[in-house]
């Protein structure tokens, strides 16, 4: 029995199957990449503000730190994916969509083509799909998380797409819009079968999904309101209503937390009451994105992660299943599943 | 404190040029968003264009894309706006505003800029 030496090199757990031996951890403990060592996940507030990208430790009461990353701009939208230890974001002064390891090395480009104003951005960590709203050419796409197999999503009847946020474990994925009639959008991953949730509403930003309740977060830049909803945009609560100007907002465990761009802070407050308020920063600038980076925020199973559904392209995930996907001028055959080139 | 004064308007042909320029008093000038707005006679003041606070980034309404085109110069404390292929319907009373939104599509409403020029007439006619 390999465990029976040095505990098969495993920091806790060792177990030991007929073809190899296997390393996992006690609940609450995650396991590094290299497969053998377990950690208590940190959890830390990540979030943009003009040519930089900052984190701030939950657990540590840590200062805010800028994460040492090279050629940022004008950084908007933020995501990660907890996985292989990523950020994901946009730069509108660059047009480019860029990931790094949290600790600011190999920055690389992975969408830096046909962007315009990108200001919304989601990462798909189940299927490793990166989704984007751009207001500019008022688009959704997607493509894979290193930029492969590029596909328009949603185009028709689309007015200045903002904010994203998924559910793969449901297949939706979930959109505001700015434009003439501001509204919150519910659609399948794969871009089909819109559904429109909630339309008396203003500007809503930095749509955020808690997984564990099943509901939406928004701030509504019209109102100064942070406002709640069931999954279909029913059962509406205001958390919030005396903030002076609420922006990026994000969700973690009991929590809600935001940011507000007339006190310049980071705050924090019970997700379903908004009470018992704590300023965790303040004398920040207009912070245009913020999340809270651990791996309870990327939970959950559906098909996509299990040999990419099979595709050989996109693996894009809906109610009950998943349909594969191709990039933009590719044809999918049906059977085998793979992409044919024009 | 910010304070803004707009230049360059007049009479122009239509299919002709102007530049306006406009001068920013206050040391915090390139930490701030600049913006262009009009106002024609009897209608709202609307959106024409605005540049972030480094230059990266530009935005432009529809009815200006192509033939307007903002810059600014940050050691000059000066935003530019370079108006080509006039028409008699951009004849306005152009205004330049300094936003402390750094960057994004807000920059495209007005409630979002804190300071405002005193604004210069151009008049594009025959």
């Known amino acids: 029995n390999p465990c029976a030496d040095r505990n098969g090199g495993c920091s806790h757990l060792c177990f030991f199957t007929p073809h190899a031996t296997r390393c996992g951890c006690p609940i609450g403990l995650e396991l590094l990449s290299d497969m053998k060592t377990c950690i208590v996940p940190e959890a830390f507030l990540v979030f943009t503000s003009r040519a930089a990208i900052h984190r701030i430790s939950l657990e540590t009461n840590n200062n805010d730190v800028a994460i040492p990353l090279t050629g940022v701009k004008e950084a908007s939208a933020l995501d990660f994916d907890v996985s292989n230890n990523h950020i994901y974001w946009t730069d509108v002064s660059l047009k480019t969509i860029s990931r790094a390891f949290m600790n600011g090395s190999s920055v690389e480009h992975v969408v830096e083509f046909g962007l315009d104003y990108p200001e919304g951005m989601a990462v798909d960590w189940m299927g490793k799909n990166l989704y984007w709203a751009d207001t500019g050419t008022n688009r959704i796409e997607v493509a894979r998380l290193d930029g492969q197999f590029r596909q328009v999503l949603v185009w028709r009847d689309l007015d200045n797409p903002r904010s994203l946020a998924l559910d793969p474990t449901k297949g939706y994925i979930y959109w505001t819009e700015w434009g003439g009639k501001p509204r919150i959008v519910r659609a399948f991953m794969d871009g089909t079968n819109c559904m429109t949730l909630v339309d008396k509403v203003g500007r809503a930003n930095d749509l955020t999904i808690d997984y564990a309740d099943q509901r939406l977060y928004w701030t509504d830049l019209d109102t100064n309101m942070i406002e709640s909803s069931n999954m279909l945009g029913q059962e509406r609560v205001v958390i919030a209503d005396d903030l002076p100007h609420p922006f990026g907002l994000t969700q973690y465990s009991d929590y809600i937390y935001w940011t507000d761009w007339n006190l310049h802070s980071i705050e924090r407050a019970d997700k379903t009451s908004g009470r018992n308020r704590t300023l965790i920063q303040g004398h920040l600038d207009f912070v245009m994105d913020i999340l809270v980076f651990h791996s309870s925020r990327q939970d959950g199973l559906n098909d996509c992660m299990h040999n990419n559904g099979q595709c050989g392209q996109l693996c894009l995930a809906i109610p009950g299943g998943h349909r594969c996907g191709c990039a933009s001028h590719y044809t999918l055959d049906p059977s085998s599943r793979n992409c044919s080139p024009p | 404190e910010v304070q803004l004064v707009e230049s360059g308007g007049g009479l122009v042909q239509p299919g002709g040029s102007l530049r306006l320029s406009c001068a920013a008093s206050?040391?915090?000038?390139?930490?701030?968003?600049m913006g262009w707005f009009r106002q024609a006679p009897g209608k709202e003041r609307e959106f024409v264009a605005a540049?972030?606070?480094?230059?990266?980034?530009?935005y432009y309404a529809d009815s200006v894309k192509g033939r307007f085109t903002i810059s600014r110069d940050n050691s000059k404390n000066t935003v530019y706006l370079q108006m080509n292929s006039l028409r008699p319907e951009d004849t306005a009373v152009y205004y330049c505003?300094?936003?402390?939104?750094?960057?994004?599509?807000?920059?495209?409403?007005?409630?979002?800029?804190?300071?405002w020029g005193q604004g210069t007439l151009v008049t594009v006619s025959s």
């Open positions: 505003a300094a936003s402390p939104i750094p960057y994004g599509s807000l920059l495209r409403r007005r409630n979002n800029y804190d300071y």
């Open positions: 206050g040391r915090t000038f390139s930490s701030y968003a």
């Open positions: 540049i972030s606070w480094s230059g990266g980034s530009t």
